[in-house]
């Protein structure tokens, strides 16, 4: 081997990769409200719903400072895993019932996608333990009946809001630490 | 520009140490897993050992484990591999890496032979 | 034998589109798990090519391209130049192994 030539800068440093991530989180959470909006104007939401299958809250925002970077980033990765299959499943079993919220659950698929991929990369650049394979999942039952299906809808664009909400908030107290 | 530059390579005798560094700049560091992969005269790349940004996860190859001890020293901008009990299969191209990897050094030759 | 499956060599003539395939496993590239491919030029260290299945770094001319599906992913070059002959290596983390993997290299030449 011969002298070091030195490379040109290839990507992002993890912390600019942070930030980024941070944004796409950011602007994914809007998306979740104005979606959130949008399903309470058309199919008026009675109380709260929650759905077994969902992840419960990773943490309240007051118990992140005891957090370290490698819990937060694979806890959170599980979490919007479980919320990109139940979106899949959400737009699979409720075609026709939600059409009216197309293209927006579409977008809130690909943008999710996207930032499972981000948090993906920012693990293997620092190189922290990645997620075990995922178990193969039991199928999701499908709603018994489509007021069922949009009781679903309210609990997973719910649930997913307070996740991501949380993650704003995480990520950006991480990026002090990195 | 980003730079890793390898050190420590040399001839050793089956059974014995020796200690690679690799110096890294510019770039952040300490914000990135470091690696050790290594390269067989006229192979591919094998990867040996990992370590997380902050030092507090290592992973090694089945091949080097509990002979081999990944370190880093985040104040140096340096990142180590201590090589023990060498056998003439560790022969090989060392190069240092940094993130998944994105950035690589140009390599250190290590021979094992008597 | 590499966990990691790379075609041992590939060849086209110079403006051809050429693939190279990486073919893994649940426990690597079917575990949704980023696929990364390197260039190592002769007598150079390797460098990265496509990190994140089909990410370009700067620098990285838009001929190549990187693509996943289930357990393979593959490598495209298209409009091959004669500085395209090194041999490309694919990587992806193996849960099962605790750590990355490399494929056994696809030697490519242009003819």
């Known amino acids: 081997p011969g002298p070091p030539p030195g490379s040109p800068r290839a990507s992002p440093d993890p912390r600019a990769e942070l930030d980024s991530t941070v944004l796409l989180t950011r602007s994914l959470l809007e998306d979740t409200r104005q979606l959130t909006i949008q399903l309470k104007d058309k199919f008026p939401a009675d109380g709260d719903h929650n759905l077994d299958s969902l992840p419960t809250l990773a943490m309240s925002a007051g118990a992140l400072g005891a957090l370290q970077l490698p819990s937060v980033l694979t806890r959170l990765r599980a979490d919007l895993l479980s919320y990109l299959r139940h979106v899949q499943w959400l737009r699979r079993a409720m075609g026709s019932s939600l059409k009216t919220l197309e293209p927006e659950l579409g977008t809130l698929q690909t943008r999710l996608d996207r930032l499972l991929r981000r948090l993906q990369l920012l693990m293997s650049r620092l190189a922290l333990p990645q997620l075990p394979p995922d178990p193969p999942a039991p199928p999701l039952a499908p709603p018994s009946s489509t007021w069922g299906g949009i009781r679903a809808a309210h609990a997973i664009l719910g649930g997913l809001h307070l996740t991501l909400d949380w993650a704003v908030r995480g990520l950006l107290l991480l990026k002090t630490r990195l | 520009e980003v730079q890793l530059l390898e050190s420590g390579g040399g001839l050793v005798q089956p059974g014995g140490s020796l200690r690679l560094s690799c110096a890294a700049s510019g770039f952040t560091f300490s914000s990135y897993g470091g690696h050790w992969v290594r390269q067989a005269p006229g192979k591919g790349l094998e990867w040996v050992a990992l370590?997380?940004?902050?030092?507090?996860?290592?992973y090694y190859a089945d091949s080097v484990k509990g002979r081999f001890t990944i370190s880093r020293d985040n104040s140096k901008n340096t990142l180590y591999l201590q090589m023990n009990s060498l056998r003439a299969e560790d022969t090989a191209v060392y190069y240092c890496?940094?993130?998944?990897?994105?950035?690589w050094g140009q390599g250190t030759l290590v021979t094992v032979s008597s | 034998q590499s966990v990691l499956t790379q075609p041992p060599s590939a060849s086209g003539t110079p403006g051809q589109r050429v693939t190279i395939s990486c073919s893994g496993s649940s426990s690597n590239i079917g575990s949704d798990y980023d696929v990364h491919w390197y260039q190592q030029l002769p007598g150079t260290a390797p460098k990265l090519l496509i990190y994140?299945?089909?990410e370009r770094p700067s620098g990285v001319p838009d001929r190549f391209s990187g693509s996943k599906s289930g357990t393979s992913a593959s490598l495209a070059i298209s409009g091959l130049r004669s500085e395209d002959e090194a041999d490309y290596y694919c990587a992806a983390w193996d849960f099962s192994l605790s750590g990355p993997v490399f494929g056994g290299g696809t030697k490519l030449t242009v003819l």
């Open positions: 890496a940094a993130g998944v990897p994105d950035y």
């Open positions: 370590i997380s940004y902050d030092g507090s996860y290592k």
């Open positions: 994140s299945n089909n």
